[in-house]
C-alpha cells in the first residue's frame, strides 16, 4: 500500500485537526523542554507543507519519509545543543538512526515543574478567548511530561477536556462542575500513560513476541467466543499499532488504530457480543471504548485442555511443526477459560508449558515425561492467589495510607539504594492496588491486582534504567517481563546495604507543612519514613510505627500552635532526638 507522498496520505486519512494534534504530540514527546510557541510554529510549518503535498503529491520533498520530514524539522530548532546537550548529536545522523537516537533520548522523568491548576474563572476565560490554543496547550503539556503517552488516546482525552470546559464554563457553579471532571481526567491520564509505558517497554526491551503473547492472553480473556484465527489477526494488527506509537510513528499509529476499530466493528459477530455500543460512537470514543470493553461471556461448554495438550500422542509433533502457533493456541485456550487469572500468570503458565515441551520432546518417552505438566502449574497459580489474599487482608486492616506505609517500608528494605522520591512514588502507587482491586468480587481480584502491579513496577524499572543504582532492581527488571512482580516480591532485606548516615536536615520541618494538602502532607511523612528506613533498615514495624505516630502528633501539635514556626523550631529537635533514641 505505497503512496507517492506519505505525508499527503496521512493528512488525507486523518484530517487536518487530528493531523495537527498528532504532530504536536510527536514533537512535544521528542523535544520535551521546548517552549509551546516553538512547537506550534513547527507544527504549522509541517501542516502547510502537508497541504502542498495534498495539492500535488509530486511537489518537492513530498516523497520523503515522515521520519525524514519530522526529523529535519526538529533539527531546525536553534537552541537544540544548549537545551538538550548530546541529543543534538542525533541531527548528525541519517534516518533511521536519527529517529532511533531521538527515541533513546526520551526522558521518562523530565525536569519540568508540576502543572499548577489556575482558578476556574481564569481557565474558562482562556478557553473562551482561544479554544484552539487552550487545547493545543493541553496536548503539549501532557505529551512532554509523558513521552510515551498513546497518541490517539491523548486526542480522546483532549476531546473530553474540551467537552468539560464547554459544559462547565456555562454552569451556575463552574468549579463544582469542572473540578471533578479535571480530577478524573488527570487520574485516568496518569493510569493510561503508565499502561502504555508498559506496552512500549514490552516491545522495546523484550521484543514483539513478548507483546504478542501478552495480547493473545488479554484478547482471549476479552473475546472468549472468538476463534483462535480471529484473535491472532487482532493481535497482529494491535502489535503493529503499538509498535508504531512506541516508535514515534504517531500518524501511522493513529491511522492503523482507526482501521482496526473499523475492522472490529465490521466483524463483531466473530469477535464479541460486547462491541455493539462501542461501534455507534465517533472514532476517538469508539477506539477508546473498544480498548476498554468488558470481557464477553465465556462459551458454556469449553472442554478440558488435557486431551489436546497432555493426553494426545501428537503433542510433540504439533509443537515441532509450529512452536509459536501451538503455544499461542495453548495460551488462547487457557486464557479464554480463565478471566479470573492475571495475564502475567497466564504467560507464566505458557512459559512453564513451553519449558516442559522443550525438555520432554527431546526425551526417550515424551508422553511419560510431560504427562504431569499441569502439576507444575500449582505453585505458579497459588503464589499470586495467596499474595492477593494476604495483601487485601492487610489493606482492609490498615486502610490506604497505612497500607502504603507498609509497602514503603517493605520496598525500602528490599532496595534501599533507590532514590527516596522514586520509592515514595512507586510505593504510593503500589498501595493504590488495595482501593482499586480489593473491593472487587474474588474472581476479578487477581487480574486487577497483578496486572496493575506490573504497570507500577514498570515505572520503577524505567526510572531505575535512567539512573541505575541497584543490581537487584536491574535483575528483576531485565531477566523476565512476566516474572518481574514475583521477582520483586521475593526480594528480602538487603543485607549488603550500608545504612545511610543520619542527617538532621532530612527530619527538619517548618510551618509550611501546615498549609499543605492532605496528599502533600502524606508525601512529606512518607518521605521521612523512607529516610528513616534507609537510616535504620533493621528497625521493627513497632519501632517505625512509634516514630511515625510521634511525628503525626508533633506536626498536629505545631500546626495548632499560635506561633507555628517557633513550635517547629523547638519541638523538631526533640522529635529527632526521641526518634533516634527509639531506633537505637
Amino acid at each position: 500500500d505505497t503512496h507517492k507522498s506519505e505525508v499527503a496520505h496521512r493528512f488525507k486519512d486523518l484530517g487536518e485537526e487530528h493531523f495537527k494534534g498528532l504532530v504536536l504530540v510527536a514533537f512535544s514527546q521528542y523535544l520535551q523542554q521546548c517552549p509551546f510557541e516553538e512547537h506550534v510554529k513547527l507544527v504549522n510549518e509541517v501542516t502547510e507543507f502537508a497541504k502542498t503535498c495534498v495539492a500535488d503529491e509530486s511537489a518537492e520533498n513530498c516523497d520523503k519519509s515522515l521520519h525524514t520530514l519530522f526529523g529535519d524539522k526538529l533539527c531546525t530548532v536553534a537552541t537544540l545543543r544548549e537545551t538538550y546537550g548530546e541529543m543534538a548529536d542525533c541531527c548528525a545522523k541519517q534516518e533511521p538512526e536519527r529517529n532511533e537516537c531521538f527515541l533513546q533520548h526520551k526522558d521518562d522523568n523530565p525536569n519540568l515543574p508540576p502543572l499548577v491548576r489556575p482558578e476556574v474563572d481564569v481557565m474558562c476565560t482562556a478557553f473562551h478567548d482561544n479554544e484552539a490554543t487552550f487545547l493545543k496547550k493541553y496536548l503539549y503539556e501532557v505529551a512532554r511530561r509523558h513521552p510515551y503517552f498513546y497518541a490517539p488516546e491523548l486526542l480522546f482525552f483532549a476531546a473530553r477536556y474540551k467537552a468539560a470546559f464547554a459544559e462547565c464554563c456555562q454552569a451556575a457553579d463552574k468549579a463544582a462542575c469542572l473540578l471533578p471532571k479535571l480530577d478524573e481526567l488527570r487520574d485516568e491520564g496518569k493510569a493510561s500513560s503508565a499502561k502504555q509505558r508498559l506496552k512500549c517497554a514490552s516491545l522495546q526491551k523484550f521484543g514483539d513476541r513478548a507483546f504478542k503473547a501478552w495480547a493473545v492472553a488479554r484478547l482471549s480473556q476479552k473475546f472468549p467466543k472468538a476463534e483462535f484465527a480471529e484473535v491472532s489477526k487482532l493481535v497482529t494488527d494491535l502489535t503493529k499499532v503499538h509498535t508504531e506509537c512506541c516508535h514515534g510513528d504517531l500518524l501511522e499509529c493513529a491511522d492503523d488504530r482507526a482501521d482496526l476499530a473499523k475492522y472490529m466493528c465490521e466483524n463483531q459477530d466473530s469477535i464479541s457480543s460486547k462491541l455493539k455500543e462501542c461501534c455507534d460512537k465517533p472514532l476517538l470514543e469508539k477506539s477508546h471504548c473498544l480498548a476498554e470493553v468488558e470481557n464477553d461471556e465465556m462459551p458454556a461448554d469449553l472442554p478440558s485442555l488435557a486431551a489436546d495438550y497432555v493426553e494426545s500422542k501428537d503433542v510433540c509433533k504439533n509443537y515441532a511443526e509450529a512452536k509459536d502457533v501451538f503455544l499461542g493456541m495453548f495460551l488462547y485456550e487457557y486464557a479464554r477459560r480463565h478471566p479470573d487469572y492475571s495475564v502475567m500468570l497466564l504467560l507464566r503458565l505458557a512459559k512453564a508449558y513451553e519449558a516442559t515441551l522443550e525438555k520432554c520432546c527431546a526425551a526417550a518417552d515424551p508422553h511419560e515425561c510431560y504427562a504431569k505438566v499441569f502439576d507444575e502449574f500449582q505453585p505458579l497459580v497459588e503464589e499470586p492467589q495467596n499474595l492477593v489474599k494476604q495483601n487485601c487482608e492487610l489493606f482492609e486492616q490498615l486502610g490506604e495510607y497505612k497500607f502504603q506505609n507498609a509497602l514503603l517500608v517493605r520496598y525500602t528494605k528490599k532496595v534501599p539504594q533507590v532514590s527516596t522520591p522514586t520509592l515514595v512514588e512507586v510505593s504510593r502507587n503500589l498501595g493504590k492496588v488495595g482501593a482499586k482491586c480489593c473491593k472487587l468480587p474474588e474472581a476479578k481480584r487477581m487480574p486487577c491486582a497483578e496486572d496493575y502491579l506490573s504497570v507500577v513496577l514498570n515505572r520503577l524499572c524505567v526510572l531505575h534504567e535512567k539512573t541505575p543504582v541497584s543490581e537487584k532492581v536491574t535483575k528483576c527488571c531485565t531477566e523476565s517481563l512476566v516474572n518481574r512482580r514475583p521477582c520483586f516480591s521475593a526480594l528480602e532485606l538487603d543485607e549488603a546495604y550500608v545504612p545511610k548516615a543520619f542527617n538532621a536536615e532530612t527530619f527538619t520541618f517548618h510551618a509550611d507543612m501546615c498549609t499543605l494538602s492532605e496528599k502533600e502532607k502524606q508525601v512529606k511523612k512518607q518521605t521521612a519514613l523512607v529516610e528513616l528506613v534507609k537510616h535504620k533498615p533493621k528497625a521493627t514495624k513497632e519501632q517505625l510505627k512509634g516514630v511515625m505516630d510521634n511525628f503525626a502528633a508533633f506536626v498536629e501539635k505545631c500546626c495548632k500552635a499560635d506561633d507555628k514556626e517557633a513550635c517547629f523550631a523547638e519541638e523538631g529537635p526533640k522529635f529527632v532526638a526521641a526518634s533516634q533514641a527509639a531506633l537505637a
Partner: nanobody, 115 residues
Framework: QVQLQESGGGLVQPGGSLRLSCAAS????????MAWYRRAPGKERELVAL???????NYADSVKGRFTISRDYAKNTVYLQMDSLKPEDTAAYYC?????????WGQGTQVTVSS
C-alpha cells in the same frame, strides 16, 4: 485428588424449595465451569444449570425462572436454589465441575417432590 461434597437434597412438597450445595476440594486449579445435572428414573441424564468463571449462566428450559445457580469462587462451591418445585423435578442431582485437567462428578443427592 478432587473430592465433591454434595448436600441439600430431600423430600419436599410441590411448590416448595430446596438449596443444593456442592463443595469441591483438592484441586490445584479453579474450576472454570460448575454445573448441576439430574437423572430421573428411567431417563437420560440432563443438564439442569451451569455457571462459568465469569458468572455466565445457562439453564435447561424446564427450570428457567424457578432454579438459580450460583457459586462462591473463594470456597470452590456451587449452589442450586430450587423454587416452585414440581413432581417432575424428582431425580438424583449430580454436581459436575471442570478445570483445565478434567471433569469431576459428585455421587449425587436425591430430590423427591411429592405430596
Amino acid at each position: 485428588q478432587v473430592q465433591l461434597q454434595e448436600s441439600g437434597g430431600g423430600l419436599v412438597q410441590p411448590g416448595g424449595s430446596l438449596r443444593l450445595s456442592c463443595a469441591a476440594s483438592g484441586s490445584i486449579f479453579t474450576f472454570y465451569r460448575m454445573a448441576w445435572y439430574r437423572r430421573a428414573p428411567g431417563k437420560e441424564r440432563e443438564l439442569v444449570a451451569l455457571i462459568t468463571t465469569d458468572t455466565s449462566t445457562n439453564y435447561a428450559d424446564s427450570v428457567k425462572g424457578r432454579f438459580t445457580i450460583s457459586r462462591d469462587y473463594a470456597k470452590n462451591t456451587v449452589y442450586l436454589q430450587m423454587d416452585s418445585l414440581k413432581p417432575e423435578d424428582t431425580a438424583a442431582y449430580y454436581c459436575n465441575v471442570r478445570n483445565v485437567e478434567r471433569d469431576y462428578w459428585g455421587q449425587g443427592t436425591q430430590v423427591t417432590v411429592s405430596s
